[in-house]
């Protein structure tokens, strides 16, 4: 099943996708579409790239903000709404016969948590480190936040929590 990414309404969603250009700098076309990857191309295309640059966007909210020329074709959706929820297809159109790499990811857009005057430690910890999600008979799924998390003290946790909230970073759950 698709990896899930969670973003709050009004924040930016980040859906990772990448490939390694071989040789370096030898870019391949990529499409992002709403809906699972079909047989070829993408359905409901939101963004396309060619061998040089982004050449088609259906809205100014869709961006590739990573190092596109190194194969980072992660999609950023700005100012997400509940309607942005759903499965997205990242298709890396590697030249050849049926060579494409297909990645389906699921974006879950949630309403912002109610603001309380004095957030508790528990709430901040949950924001920084999302709760484990139960996935049927397989038990709790792995959860991650963007980047790696070394040993941190409580002060660092509060700082990280605020940075995540300010940046609108998307939380990933498997």
């Amino acid at each position: 099943s698709e990896v899930e990414y969670i973003a709050e309404v009004g924040q930016n969603a980040y859906l990772p996708c990448s490939y390694t250009p071989a040789p370096p700098g030898n870019l391949v076309p990529v499409c992002w579409g709403k809906g699972a990857c079909p047989v070829f191309d993408c359905s409901n295309v939101v963004l396309r790239t060619d061998n040089r640059d982004v050449n088609d966007r259906t809205s100014g909210r869709y961006w590739l903000k990573g190092d596109f020329h190194k194969g980072d074709v992660s999609l950023t959706i700005e100012n997400v709404t509940l309607a942005d929820s759903g499965v997205y297809c990242c298709r890396i159109q590697i030249p050849g016969i049926m060579n494409d790499e297909k990645h389906n990811v699921k974006l879950v857009v949630i309403k912002p948590a109610k603001v309380t005057p004095a957030p508790t430690l528990q709430r901040d910890l949950t924001s920084a480190f999302p709760r484990m999600l139960t996935t049927g008979e397989h038990g709790p799924a792995e959860t991650q936040t963007p980047g790696s998390l070394p040993d941190v003290n409580l002060t660092q946790i509060f700082t990280l929590t605020n940075e995540l909230r300010d940046s609108g970073a998307t939380i990933r759950t498997a």
């Epitope: 391949v28 076309p29 499409c31 579409g33 809906g35 699972a36 079909p38 047989v39 070829f40 191309d41 993408c42 359905s43 409901n44 295309v45 396309r48 060619d50 061998n51 088609d56 259906t58 159109q93 590697i94 030249p95 050849g96 016969i97 049926m98 060579n99 494409d100």
Partner: antibody, heavy 120, light 107 residues
């Protein structure tokens, strides 16, 4: 107005070759994936092959894999199908078909078709 | 490959009547299903895509529904020009496949 005009069909002997062309006009050719679809006499529609907007990625039905090659020339707004090692069962009307504007593997415009007859 | 079974093979109706055409997939195709109309000597014409979206220029009398394995094309009121062969096509799994067609003929 979108126009798709196929050419290159005809009578060919088993084992022979043909090259079909599809000239397109009326829209931005490079953005869309394209396909060839055929209809054999008395039968239904069969998808044959597809090519991505860039032309780098190609897709084939098992029945033609290794014998047919799809290609496109974006500068000429033209789609091609090179058909080698033709068999009697390849006899059909061949249509070029444009993929949907926002992707998806349905076909929103079709040519009128060109007849390929494989017979000795 | 996914097999699409269309029923009935032939539908005999009069102008003004309602036509209901069925397409059943051998496994789920989500909502990745399209419907086409084809008349003798003509190219197919896209009617419906993504199971329920009407293509540009298609009259409101045509509607599509369903998801997963069972799909329906409905023509609410048959006009003389609607008598033709109708095909469904799935694009959720390789290879793309079409149904065998339903012929809607004048009774």
């Amino acid at each position: 107005e979108v126009q798709l005009v196929e050419s290159g069909g005809g009578l060919v002997q088993p084992g022979g070759s043909l090259r079909l062309s599809c000239a397109a006009s009326g829209f931005t050719f490079r953005q869309n994936a394209w396909s060839w679809v055929r209809r054999a006499p008395g039968k239904g529609l069969e998808w044959v092959s597809a090519i991505s907007g860039s032309g780098g990625s190609t897709y084939y039905a098992d029945s033609v894999k290794g014998r047919f090659t799809i290609s496109r020339d974006n500068s000429k707004n033209t789609l091609y199908l090179q058909m080698n090692s033709l068999r009697a069962e390849d006899t059909a009307v061949y249509y070029c078909a444009k993929g949907g504007d926002y992707g998806g593997n349905y076909f929103d415009y079709w040519g009128q078709g060109t007849l390929v007859t494989v017979s000795s | 490959e996914i097999v699409l079974t269309q029923s009935p093979a032939t539908l005999s109706l009069s102008p003004g009547e309602r036509a209901t055409l069925s397409c059943r997939a051998s496994q789920s195709v989500s909502s990745y299903l399209a419907w086409y109309q084809q008349k003798p000597g003509q190219a197919p014409r896209l009617l419906i895509y993504d199971a329920s979206n009407r293509a540009t220029g298609i009259p409101a009398s045509f509607s599509g529904s369903g998801s997963g394995t069972d799909f329906t094309l409905t023509i609410s009121r048959l006009e003389p020009e609607d008598f033709a062969v109708y095909y469904c096509q799935q694009y959720g799994s390789s290879p793309l496949t079409f149904g065998g067609g339903t012929k809607v003929e004048i009774k």
